[in-house]
C-alpha cells in the first residue's frame, strides 16, 4: 500500500486540472493510481480526491471515490491508490446484514444478561446470560430482548457507492 497522501500535499491547481499524467503500460497493465487509455497505449493517472485504482489493472477508468455518509467519520481520505476509509461514529456500528448504514448501539443489556463487550464501530454491545455465561443466540428475538453481537471487521474502505 502506498504512503497516504493528504489534500495539503497537492496544490489546488494540480487537483483541479482535468489533464492527467500519462505513462506506458507494462505488459498491458497500468500501475495503481492509473487506468489504461482506450487504445491501450497509455496509463492515465486517476484524479486525486475524485477517483482511484488499488492494483495493477487494465481498467478503462478509475473508480469513483466513496464519500462518507452522515453518521460516519472519514478515517483517511481518498488518494489515487486508495479509496476513502469510512467508519461509523462513536456510539454506532455497521452490521454485516445492513452495511449500508450505521446503527445506534444499544445502551444496555436485557434483564438477566450482562455486558461483556463494548460498542465498537463494527459491533453492537455484547451480552451474555448471567447464569450460563453463553452469548445470546443470533436469532432475532422479541424487541425488548434484542441483543446483537456482530463479529464484524475493522474499518475498511466503504465501497458501496464507488
Amino acid at each position: 500500500e502506498s504512503a497516504l497522501i493528504t489534500q495539503q500535499d497537492l496544490a489546488p491547481q494540480q487537483r483541479a486540472a482535468p489533464q492527467q499524467k500519462r505513462s506506458s503500460p507494462s505488459e498491458g497493465l497500468c500501475p495503481p493510481g492509473h487506468h489504461i487509455s482506450e487504445d491501450g497505449r497509455d496509463c492515465i493517472s486517476c484524479k486525486y480526491g475524485q477517483d482511484y485504482s488499488t492494483h495493477w489493472n487494465d481498467l478503462l477508468f478509475c473508480l469513483r471515490c466513496t464519500r462518507c455518509d452522515s453518521g460516519e467519520v472519514e478515517l483517511s481520505p481518498c488518494t489515487t491508490t486508495r479509496n476513502t476509509v469510512c467508519q461509523c461514529e462513536e456510539g454506532t456500528f455497521r452490521e454485516e446484514d445492513s452495511p449500508e448504514m450505521c446503527r445506534k448501539c444499544r445502551t444496555g443489556c436485557p434483564r438477566g444478561m450482562v455486558k461483556v463487550g463494548d460498542c465498537t464501530p463494527w459491533s453492537d454491545i455484547e451480552c451474555v446470560h448471567k447464569e450460563s455465561g453463553t452469548k445470546h443466540s443470533g436469532e432475532v428475538p422479541a424487541v425488548e430482548e434484542t441483543v446483537t453481537s456482530s463479529p464484524g471487521t475493522p474499518a475498511s474502505p466503504c465501497s458501496l457507492s464507488g
Partner: antibody
Framework: EVQLVESGGGLVQPGGSLRLSCAAS????????MSWVRQAPGKGLEWVAN????????YYVDSVKGRFTISRDNAKNSLYLQMNSLRAEDTAVYYC?????????????WGKGTLVTVSS | QSALTQPPSASGSPGQSVTISCTGT?????????VSWYQQHPGKAPKLMIY???ERPSGVPDRFSGSKSGNTASLTVSGLRPEDEADYYC??????????FGGGTQLTVL
C-alpha cells in the same frame, strides 16, 4: 477543446416522450461520469441524473425516477436522456455536463443546452 | 431535499468586494465539504467557478474565493469587474448520490 452539444429538445404534449442527445468531443468521454442538469424558465438549476463511465451505475433526482432514463454510447461519444410521461413541470433547458467527481457536484464543462417544452 | 437558500440579488461597485451566501442544512452543506459555485451569464451555459468549498479550477481568476461555516457557504468576488455581472448558483452534495442547487443570486455591478 472540450465541447458538449445537446439536441433533441422541442415541444411535446403532457404524457409524451422525448429523447435528448449530447455529443461530446475534446476529451476521453469514456473516462468520465456524465450528468444532466435542467433549468426551468427564469428558475434555478436542478441536477437530474448522472451515469458512470461504463453505464453500470445511474442515479436520478426523485422527481424523475421511473420516468427518465440516462444512457450513453461510448463508441459514439454520446450521452442520452430518454424522457417519458412528461409533465408541465419538466419544461426546462436541459444541459449535459461532464461530471468530474461522479457525484454531480463538480461539473467542470457544460453544453449550451436544449429547450424542452411540455404543453398542450 | 429542498433547495439551498441564496439571496435573490447582490450588488457592488467596480473594485469593491461582494459576498453571496448559500444556506443549507446539517445534511448537506454542514455535513460535506463538497460545495460548488457556478457563474451563468444570460442565455449562456453555467461555468464552474469554485468546487470543494474553496478550490478554483484553472482559468478562474483568484478574485473568486469560497468559504464555509456551519451550514452556510459563501462566495466572495473581490475587485468587482463589469464582466462579473451574472447569476451565481451554489450546489452541495447532499448524500445518497444526490446534489442540490441554490435558487441563484443575480449579481449586479453598479
Amino acid at each position: 477543446e472540450v465541447q458538449l452539444v445537446e439536441s433533441g429538445g422541442g415541444l411535446v404534449q403532457p404524457g409524451g416522450s422525448l429523447r435528448l442527445s449530447c455529443a461530446a468531443s475534446g476529451f476521453t468521454f469514456s473516462s468520465y461520469w456524465m450528468s444532466w442538469v435542467r433549468q426551468a424558465p427564469g428558475k434555478g438549476l436542478e441536477w437530474v441524473a448522472n451515469i458512470k463511465q461504463d453505464g453500470s451505475e445511474k442515479y436520478y433526482v426523485d422527481s424523475v425516477k421511473g420516468r427518465f432514463t440516462i444512457s450513453r454510447d461510448n463508441a459514439k461519444n454520446s450521452l442520452y436522456l430518454q424522457m417519458n410521461s412528461l409533465r408541465a413541470e419538466d419544461t426546462a433547458v436541459y444541459y449535459c455536463a461532464r461530471d468530474f467527481s461522479g457525484y454531480g457536484d463538480y461539473l467542470d464543462y457544460w453544453g449550451k443546452g436544449t429547450l424542452v417544452t411540455v404543453s398542450s | 431535499q429542498s433547495a439551498l437558500t441564496q439571496p435573490p440579488s447582490a450588488s457592488g461597485s467596480p473594485g469593491q468586494s461582494v459576498t453571496i451566501s448559500c444556506t443549507g442544512t446539517s445534511s448537506d452543506i454542514g455535513n460535506y465539504n463538497y460545495v460548488s459555485w457556478y457563474q451563468q451569464h444570460p442565455g449562456k451555459a453555467p461555468k464552474l467557478m469554485i468546487y470543494e468549498v474553496n478550490e478554483r479550477p484553472s482559468g478562474v481568476p483568484d478574485r473568486f474565493s469560497g468559504s464555509k461555516s456551519g451550514n452556510t457557504a459563501s462566495l466572495t468576488v473581490s475587485g468587482l469587474r463589469p464582466e462579473d455581472e451574472a447569476d451565481y448558483y451554489c450546489s452541495s452534495y447532499a448524500g445518497n448520490n444526490a446534489v442540490i442547487f441554490g435558487g441563484g443570486t443575480q449579481l449586479t455591478v453598479l
